[in-house]
């Protein structure tokens, strides 16, 4: 029994941190192998992950971790049985990977904006929440080559867009990633995506159509 | 206190099969790993495999797979092993002896507790 | 699998000297995590063999402090200040690094 790709881990910085590798050989996660975690501190606990499979060979193993400070190293050590196939130490705040911005939602906005609005996934007390910049993907479902990357790099968790840069009767899906820059983290999952049809209409068809008279 | 108390000695045909008992106490059974481990007269030690009691997993040595099966009753804070096909080979005496803990650290030791033996001879 | 060899089958010892006990292996024990997983083991005259030292030079609960481990990835010494009658016994290496776990063929400390 061999380790491939040693753990790669990385975590929320609030509650969970995510480790993931691979062995030479397609691998029962649960049944072979486990994850031993203790914070590197004189009389912290030992604990167990047992992880789940990824893929064939791929294991991931989800750990509940203390609200994190960023001084703390975890110690891991992976086992076969009483084997110790690896062992490890991971930094939780140096290997951020931000939660998932949640319920992203479309309205129509006055002067034919949409207006694009998510929640941001940290609760206000927690570091990360003032540190959040995100990423929105909006892309034509029909059309993979008409799409739009958006980065916001202001506070709230919105976007307006306007109705105009998107091209008229067609079904659109924007999704949402975020990151730390401040803790260089990795981007965070995309959101699901939300769908709406864009139906703005050129501002040229929007002009009253008046017969126009000539006053001499 | 920790203690491993081992069945008493058998003395058994050429082709029958044998099961030999470890009992704990003094410890959370469920906790460590069980080795056993043969030692042939006058010889050295030889790793049979290992059990992790609170789901059965087991490891062998590739040279006893087949000849030896390894099982707990949780109940009884018990572990078995069971020797089949038996020869002249298989007379030696088999020890139990606790392993690490499931909960360890890379800190470990092991084989910190040994149960007193169990002496099988094979003999028509 | 990884071959423990202990070249010495007995070493001869006076009581109150100190003996030194060779062990080798096929692959190097020192584990990325700079722990060797070496022990030694006692079995004494008529009984279950005893750990002595884990960890190559982790001295076991209970075991007197005149018993010592050193050595590096491959070659290890199990050393005995002021030997006792009641050391008497076969020594025995063992590697923790990889299944099967394997012992040396052990050494008997004999009283001169």
């Known amino acids: 029994v061999k380790v491939l790709h040693e753990p790669s881990c990385f975590s929320d910085y609030i509650s969970t941190s995510v480790c993931q590798w691979k062995m030479d050989h397609p691998t029962n996660c649960s049944a072979e192998l486990r994850l031993s975690y203790q914070l590197d501190f004189m009389g912290s606990e030992n604990h167990t992950c047992v992880p789940e499979n990824r893929e064939d060979s791929v294991c991931v193993c989800s750990m509940p971790i203390d609200d994190a400070v960023e001084a703390d190293v975890y110690q891991l050590d992976l086992w076969a049985g009483q084997q110790l196939l690896w062992s490890g130490s991971f930094q939780p705040s140096k290997h951020v990977k931000p939660r998932t911005p949640g319920n992203l939602t479309v309205h129509p906005n006055i002067s034919h904006t949409w207006l694009l609005m998510w929640t941001n996934p940290y609760p206000t007390e927690n570091h990360l929440h003032s540190e959040l910049t995100y990423m929105v993907n909006v892309s034509n479902d029909n059309d993979p080559e008409d799409f739009k990357v958006y980065n916001v790099t202001y506070m709230g968790p919105t976007l307006r867009l306007a109705a105009s840069t998107l091209k008229s009767g067609a079904s659109y899906s924007a999704r949402v990633r975020a990151w730390a820059q401040t803790y260089n983290s990795t981007w965070s999952d995309w959101s699901p995506s939300t769908t709406w049809l864009n139906y703005y209409e050129p501002w040229e068809q929007h002009l009253p159509h008046h017969h126009h008279h000539h006053h001499h | 206190e920790v203690q491993l108390q081992q069945s008493g000695p058998e003395l058994v045909k050429p082709g029958a099969s044998v099961k030999i008992s470890c009992k704990a106490s003094g410890y959370t059974f469920t906790d460590y790993y069980m080795n056993w481990v043969k030692q042939s007269h006058g010889k050295s030690l030889e790793w049979i495999g290992d059990?992790?009691?609170?789901?059965?997993?087991?490891s062998y040595n590739q040279k006893f797979k087949g000849k030896a099966t390894l099982t707990v009753d949780k109940s009884s804070s018990a572990a078995y092993m069971e020797l089949r096909s038996l020869t002249s080979e298989d007379s030696a005496v088999y020890y139990c002896?606790?392993?690490?803990?499931?909960?360890?650290?890379?800190?470990?030791?092991?084989?910190?507790?040994w149960g007193q033996g169990t002496s099988v001879t094979v003999s028509s | 699998d990884i071959v423990m060899t202990q070249a010495a089958p007995s070493v001869p010892v006076t009581p109150g000297e100190s003996v030194s006990i060779s062990c080798r292996s096929s692959?190097?024990?020192?584990?990325?995590?700079?722990?060797?997983?070496l022990f030694w083991f006692v079995q004494r005259p008529g009984q279950s063999p005893q750990l002595l030292i884990y960890?190559?030079?982790n001295l076991a609960s209970g075991v007197p402090d005149r018993f010592s481990g050193s050595g590096s990835g491959t070659a290890f010494t199990l050393r005995i200040s002021r030997v006792e009658a009641e050391d008497v016994g076969v020594y025995y290496c063992?590697?923790?690094?990889?299944?099967?776990?394997?012992f040396g063929s052990g050494t008997k400390l004999d009283i001169k």
């Open positions: 960890r190559m030079s």
């Open positions: 002896a606790r392993g690490i803990s499931y909960y360890g650290n890379r800190y470990y030791f092991t084989m910190d507790y």
């Open positions: 063992m590697q923790h690094l990889e299944y099967p776990f394997t």
């Open positions: 059990i992790i009691p609170s789901n059965g997993g087991t």
């Open positions: 692959k190097s024990l020192l584990h990325s995590n700079g722990n060797t997983y």
